[in-house]
């Protein structure tokens, strides 16, 4: 516990004090107090450098002396023979002696008292930076006028912080500036600007003049910039040693000016102002930037349009420019878009079509449709080679978007008809010579495919059944051949406007308009044993003459059963209308007179017997295209007869073209549009 | 019309072979296609087997495979199943059928022919 | 092979009745299916083909319905001729094969 005074006397003083004793006193007065330590009493056995016995006084680390010997005042008034005064408020004394003493030493009679010490003048570093004023037991620093005192309580600075400048434009120097500046002072200035404008500081060489740097290079009095995470500086020195246009790149700065103890010059002065955050000019490959300009600051806006062929794409959309926004913090709004190759995606099938599997979808990639060969066509032209355009469509040169269409070939038999022996007379077929054969099994009869839709036939095939059940593909009727074929389901059965629809069609004698379509469900698949026949043309070039050869098929009646299990077929000529009128009818159901004959209907047959007959009906009469020699188009319809194995009547197609167009148009769907 | 004429009853050891003959009447052979099916007695319909004459081949039952034989005699309008290695099992009345048209299974079926196996 | 199971294997009922047989295919048979009158001594009769035509000269109180594995014959009004043994058949492949029976008697 620290002590105003105090004493310290050696061991049995004022007896002799004995032999080899080490014994230590620990001083400590108050805080702010020195020791004034002063001996009245010295009696110990002298030695060089007092080696033997001694009183020793350590201040610190320091030794304040070392006593031995005997000393007497040289004041008759004062007792004092030795005294040490430190400006410190701890001491040490020890006291040691030897083994062996000649004569006998009394040893030391010691007083210690707090004295007041100076902190102003008694030390080599002054404690104040600029007044200190001592007191007992301690010391405070005052500053001069316009000065603080710093929070360590020692410094003065002067109050040069907390301006925070915010206009755009402004000039700040060090303080008195151009005078000296303050010693040991930091001052610091803010400069805010509104986000979107960075500081630009200037400067001019001879406006800046601080204290130089040590021979380290560290400055001592220094001028420092901070913007962000950026510093420009520490500069210091006789003119201004950095850049004298400093573009900070932010809205904020810091400017710190720290000066030390010494060394005071004139100071710095600097101007600065507020431009735009200027925004680089980006190379954002494939697109143009629209307004184009040298250089780009905050709120500036520009379109960046991508190329032709490329498209930008943000979520599942795809557009073809955007806008950028330079922003406050010196970058572009919509920074990640970017224009990116348009994509046309995976092609679109097309129906009875194939398109190869691209090795890119990418702008400018080019693709091609087929069609299922030999059996469809495409109809709407184009070569089906289609290319990635930059709308991200699949472009064909003469189609545009639009997709190619496959349709079935018409009238060409995968194998053409041989007849092989001696219908009625007819020979066995094979249903590739005639794919377009269609059986109806109630009532027993036959139809002809004109397209994937549609199935051509007598009207008085469907008269009595507006359901009717049909196949395609097989050449024997057979059940389990049929099970193995493709069953037709109808839509809607079609007959001509101009057929009499009668109470008791098996006494019928007028044939006239003997054709109806029927509208089938689903489309119906192309194959080898699948294909529609051609319709005729409108030009006279399809007008029958006499002796013209044609094909029919069917199921119909033969010499020797009622009804052919096999496909049969017969190649007749035309004849003259006449030469059925002629014919005797069979059984009839009615006066000969009463049968119509018509310009809409075809007279054929009449040699070796070949003939159609019962169930063969709406089966066609197969003519060769004319202008098309590997085709066959429908010149005609089974229709009726006078008596099998002579000549039969057929349905002059060619008469009702505008009608099956019609038909098939007002009732076609979207599917096949 | 068609008439379908069969051979008669038969009376087999077991091991043995039988070969019933269906002729065909009022018609070609080879207009048609011949199915032959059985029935052991008390039990129900079983089909054997056919000749598919638009590919030419015969297609038999699983069950009967490598046991039955069935072949056509065009110039007779004849049709012949053999069914070999006889079993008790194999006692049944064996008919012969035509295939019908147009959905129709089967047209006319023989009066059939009843074969015993017994030892 | 398509398998055709045939229910109920026996069906005791009166002369008036409505009676109702069906049959289920292992697998889908689209409408190729008949239906057959067997009496004891004679070779089965065919009544119904296409799953639902009526075979010509057999009374209208024969009926068959259905299409891809569900079928059904019925026999609105039983007259005391009907008592029988009816068949199902499917002819959708080559390989024929017949329901196991459904034996119609008197109660």
């Known amino acids: 516990e620290p002590t105003m005074y105090g004493e310290i006397l050696s061991p049995n003083y004022p007896q002799a004090y004995p032999s080899e004793v080490e014994k230590s006193w620990d001083i400590e007065v108050p805080e702010g107090y020195g020791i004034h330590l002063y001996f009245t009493h010295l009696d110990i056995e002298l030695s060089e450098n007092c080696a033997y016995d001694s009183v020793q006084i350590i201040s610190g680390d320091t030794e304040e002396g070392r006593l031995c010997g005997q000393r007497s005042s040289n004041n008759p008034h004062s007792p004092i023979v030795e005294e040490f005064q430190v400006p410190y408020n701890k001491l040490q004394v020890i006291f040691k002696s030897d083994f062996s003493n000649e004569e006998r030493f009394t040893g030391f009679a010691a007083y210690y008292v707090a004295t007041d010490i100076n902190e102003c003048t008694d030390f080599v570093d002054v404690p104040c930076s600029h007044f200190c004023n001592n007191f007992i037991g301690g010391y405070f620093c005052s500053c001069p006028p316009e000065y603080f005192l710093h929070d360590d309580m020692k410094n003065c600075g002067v109050n040069c912080s907390g301006d925070v400048f915010t206009a755009l434009i402004g000039e700040i120097a060090s303080p008195n500036y151009p005078k000296p500046y303050p010693e040991n002072s930091r001052c610091e200035y803010q400069i805010r600007l509104e986000k979107g404008f960075q500081v630009v500081v200037t400067l001019r060489r001879e406006d800046f003049d601080v204290e130089a740097a040590d021979s380290a290079g560290n400055c001592l009095d220094s001028l420092v910039f901070v913007a962000g995470d950026r510093q420009f500086g520490p500069y210091c020195g006789h003119g201004f040693p950095g850049p004298l246009n400093i573009e900070t790149k932010s809205n904020a700065l810091d400017i710190i000016f720290q000066t030390d103890l010494t060394g005071q010059k004139k100071g710095w002065k600097l101007r600065y102002h507020g431009d735009p955050m200027p925004c680089p000019k980006e190379d954002t490959p494939n697109s143009v930037w629209e307004p184009a300009k040298a250089k780009y600051v905050f709120r500036d806006v520009v379109q960046i349009t991508c190329l032709d062929g490329f498209e930008v794409v943000e979520g599942r959309v795809g557009a073809t420019s955007f806008y950028s926004t330079c922003q406050s913090n010196g970058k572009w709004s919509n920074s990640k878009l970017k224009c990116q190759p348009v994509d046309c995606g995976i092609p679109e099938s097309i129906e009875n079509g194939k398109v190869e599997d691209p090795e890119s979808t990418l702008f400018g990639s080019v693709i091609r449709y087929t069609c299922e060969e030999p059996y469809y066509y495409m109809e709407n032209g184009g070569g089906g080679e289609y290319h990635c355009a930059g709308n991200g469509s699949w472009v064909n040169e003469v189609l545009g978007p639009e997709l190619p269409k496959c349709v079935p070939v018409c009238g060409v038999p995968r194998e053409p008809f041989e007849e092989k022996q001696r219908i009625i007379g007819g020979s066995d077929a094979d249903i590739k010579n005639f794919p377009w054969q269609v059986f109806f099994d109630n009532p027993w009869a036959g139809g002809a495919l004109i397209n994937e839709y549609w199935v051509l036939t007598a009207a008085h095939v469907v008269e009595g059944n507006r359901e009717p059940t049909m196949y395609v593909g097989s050449t024997s009727v057979q059940t389990s051949r049929l099970a193995k074929s493709k069953m037709l389901t109808p839509e809607h059965v079609f007959i001509h406007p101009g057929w009499k629809l009668l109470e008791v069609p098996e006494g019928r004698t007028n044939f006239d308009n003997d054709i109806a379509l029927v509208r089938l469900k689903d489309p119906v698949k192309m194959g080898p044993t699948v294909s529609p026949i051609c319709l005729p043309g409108t030009s006279s070039d399809y007008n029958l003459m006499d002796g013209d050869l044609g094909l029919i098929s069917g199921w119909g009646r033969t010499e020797k059963r009622d009804r052919a299990v096999r496909l049969k077929a017969a190649r007749l000529p035309v004849a003259p209308l006449r030469k059925c009128k002629e014919v005797k009818v069979e059984k009839p159901t009615a006066d000969a007179e009463a049968y119509v004959f018509t310009p809409n209907m075809i007279c054929a047959g009449g040699e070796k017997g070949m003939d159609s007959c019962k169930g063969d009906s709406g089966g066609a009469f197969a003519v060769q295209d004319p202008n098309d020699k590997t085709k066959f188009y429908a010149a005609g319809l089974v229709s009726w007869g006078p008596q099998c194995g002579t000549y039969g009547l057929y349905t002059r197609v060619k008469n009702y073209v505008d009608w099956i167009m019609k038909t098939m148009q007002e009732n076609s769907t979207p599917r096949e549009d | 019309q068609v008439q379908l004429v069969q051979s008669g009853a038969e009376v087999k050891k077991p091991g043995a072979s039988v070969k019933v003959s269906c002729k065909v009447s009022g018609d070609t052979l080879t207009e048609l296609s011949m199915h032959w099916v059985r029935q052991a007695p008390g039990k129900g319909l079983e089909w054997m087997g056919t000749f598919d004459p638009e590919e030419g081949e015969t297609i038999y039952a699983q069950k009967f495979q490598g046991r039955v034989t069935m072949t056509e005699d065009t110039s007779t309008d004849t049709a012949y199943m053999e069914l070999s290695s006889l079993r008790s099992e194999d006692t049944a009345v064996y008919y012969c059928?035509?295939?019908?048209?147009?959905?129709?299974?089967?047209?006319?079926w023989g009066q059939g022919t009843l074969v015993t196996v017994s030892s | 092979d398509i398998q055709m199971t045939q229910s109920p294997s026996t069906l005791s009922a009166s002369v008036g009745d409505r009676v109702t047989i069906t049959c289920r295919a292992s697998q889908s048979i689209s409408s190729w299916l008949a239906w057959y009158q067997q009496k004891p001594g004679k070779a089965p009769k065919l009544l119904i083909y296409?799953?639902?035509s009526l075979e010509s000269g057999v009374p209208s109180r024969f009926s068959g319905s259905g299409s891809g594995t569900e079928f059904t014959l019925t026999i609105s009004s039983l007259q005391p001729d009907d008592f029988a043994t009816y068949y199902c058949q499917q002819y959708n492949s080559y390989k024929l094969t017949f329901g196991q029976g459904t034996k119609v008697e008197i109660k």
């Open positions: 059928v035509t295939e019908g048209l147009a959905g129709r299974p089967y047209d006319v």
């Open positions: 296409k799953a639902s």
